[in-house]
């Protein structure tokens, strides 16, 4: 099939980095500066993306691949191929319509992007809070309250399991 196709369409022989030049009897011409073709058989080369303004160049354009952009410090990429740059916030904050705002009590964000998330509820797992949460950090859950009864220590091995329904005399 490939052989038949190349007999019918001379352009299919043009590799990536070239285009099939109709003005020159369909010979393969290299992509002009600031353009690329990432696949063979192209009749035109695509214009390279320019990383300007708040965008900076992560990877230069080549004859076979487009430039890749990321964002200037203080901003992070959003969207496919970094189509937008969104403002960073500090840890302990989230981005709202009115800018970066501190996380409400009971929530945290340990990154420069994203939203504040509720602290883990240790009691749902039958555990106790070992380290309190902050705006920047989640709580740390420790052993269950029963394991911390007087005389018990978090570093001593747990007491042997008792049969259900039996309490110590």
């Amino acid at each position: 099939f490939e052989r038949t196709r190349s007999l019918q369409d001379p352009c299919s022989n043009c590799p990536a980095g070239t285009f099939c030049d109709n003005n020159r009897n369909q010979i393969c011409s290299p992509c002009p500066p600031n353009s690329f073709s990432s696949a063979g058989g192209q009749r035109t080369c695509d214009i390279c993306r320019q990383c300007k303004g708040v965008f900076r160049t992560r990877k230069e354009c080549s004859s076979t691949s487009n430039a890749e952009c990321d964002c200037t410090p203080g901003f992070h990429c959003l969207g496919a191929g970094c189509s937008m740059c969104e403002q960073d916030c500090k840890q302990g904050q989230e981005l709202t319509k009115k800018g970066c705002k501190d996380c409400c009590f009971g929530t945290f964000n340990d990154q420069k992007r994203g939203i504040c998330r509720p602290w883990t509820n240790c009691s749902l797992d039958g555990k106790s809070v070992l380290v309190n949460g902050t705006k920047e950090r989640d709580v740390v859950c420790g052993p269950s309250p029963a394991d911390l009864s007087p005389g018990a220590s978090s570093v001593t091995p747990p007491a042997p399991a008792r049969e259900p329904g039996h309490s110590p005399q």
Partner: nanobody, 121 residues
Amino acid sequence: QLQLVESGGGLVQPGGSLRLSCAASGFALDYSAIGWFRQAPGKEREGVLCISSSGDVTIYADSVKGRFTISRDNAKNTVYLQMNSLKPEDTAVYYCVAPRICSTYSSDDYWGQGTQVTVSS
């Protein structure tokens, strides 16, 4: 033609003040945010301040807190960056840009050509 033009840059001594202007032509600033960015020689572009269409201010650079303010005059289609207590590290080319909102920038945003600010004794 849609464009942003910065003006007001120049040479100033440390501790001095400058007021930069960003004037829009070809479109109304009323519904657009305006951000100021700067680029010092050999450094990456950094955000300075931004003012939303409703007048809310976002400070991108902690180093300008208490020294730089931003305001807008929609009647004149202009946004101002007032820079006080200038330091040598404020030396840079200052650019204004018109994103839709202060938090998010795209490759479609209009940028000015920049105005040079030099702080030196």
